[in-house]
Amino acid sequence: QDPYVKEAENLKKYFNAGHSDVADNGTLFLGILKNWKEESDRKIMQSQIVSFYFKLFKNFKDDQSIQKSVETIKEDMNVKFFNSNKKKRDDFEKLTNYSVTDLNVQRKAIHELIQVMAELSPAAKTGKRKRSQMLFRGRRASQ
Amino acid sequence: QDPYVKEAENLKKYFNAGHSDVADNGTLFLGILKNWKEESDRKIMQSQIVSFYFKLFKNFKDDQSIQKSVETIKEDMNVKFFNSNKKKRDDFEKLTNYSVTDLNVQRKAIHELIQVMAELSPAAKTGKRKRSQMLFRGRRASQ
């Protein structure tokens, strides 16, 4: 059993989250995750979900009685979602920490907007990746 | 030329974001995007970037002089990042709007945590997807 399970059960007790009323008005995340099967779509959604949990855990870093549980779960999220890749986790954290009301950040964001937009669609792939796709299509066609 | 380009230039003027000092202390997004080539990694990062822009645009929704530009860019983001898929965009917006300090949301999030974690790693794929991977590996090996 993964380490997070026991600790998540501990958090459930703390938040009284096993209570039947918690299920009122549907789910937050599970229903949405069910809608998306494609890996890249799932990553778009999971990215928001993971950042929500990180914010939630940050919000409760006062509460000593759940600190061990929170740390264990965060570590397990790091393993599962970021493949224990510290650079990936750090870049992600950087993105979640930018302040939307900081003028310097606002100006930088607008400055970078055109280039960011140009890279948004999967079609905006590097020449190398486009080429390897073409080769793969060709190979399949000739099988 | 995509419609967003002209409107992004308009925003650059408004924010005085073409000025040389904007480049001080590195980039917000571009440097991070350069680090990740794998599509699913890119989606993790782009998800945070797009939600940042949405929050930024929301922050400036009072400023009439840039409303047309903002709307055009948002629409183009919708096309590029969500493939004009309204359901995808709506699910994404839902996730970005959950409040981390609402007790009901906190309790639901903790209630769903074990199932969310179980789905985080790409390894947690359905049998069907696993099977198709195996077939593909077999086919490549026999070529």
Epitope: F60, D62, Q64 | -
Partner: nanobody, 120 residues
Framework: AVQLVESGGGLVQTGDSLRLSCVAS????????MGWFRQAPGKEREFVAR????????SYATSVEGRFAISRDNAKNTVYLQMNSLKPEDTAVYYC?????????????WGQGTQVTVSS
């Protein structure tokens, strides 16, 4: 034992603001989480907001999220509830409470309450 004294209640119009205060004595204020609860006529006492010992760990009832803000000043042994955009359904007696260590919103000591009335 901890003593808690609330103040700041009153009669206001819909859309107005009020700031409730709660002064604690008889304990180490900075060591425990604090909460606000309310009881409307003929209803059970319900949770409104809570704040951890250092001013983090904040939770709000869904009905007040975005309108009310809880804060604390450990130097003054005081917890506050800033109530904005008040509605008639916010009418209640508001109680301040210290919270049991290791629980999210289980109270151990209560103040005597302060009345808030919102007229339409």
């Amino acid at each position: 034992a901890v003593q808690l004294v609330e103040s700041g209640g009153g009669l206001v119009q819909t859309g107005d603001s009020l700031r409730l205060s709660c002064v604690a004595s008889g304990g180490t204020f900075s060591r425990y989480a604090m909460g606000w609860f309310r009881q409307a006529p003929g209803k059970e006492r319900e949770f409104v907001a809570r704040i951890g010992y250092s001013g983090r760990s904040i939770s709000y009832a869904t009905s007040v999220e975005g309108r009310f803000a809880i804060s604390r000043d450990n130097a003054k042994n005081t917890v506050y509830l800033q109530m904005n955009s008040l509605k008639p359904e916010d009418t209640a007696v508001y109680y301040c409470a210290s919270l049991v260590s290791g629980t999210l919103y289980q109270a151990d000591y209560w103040g005597q309450g302060t009345q808030v009335t919102v007229s339409s």
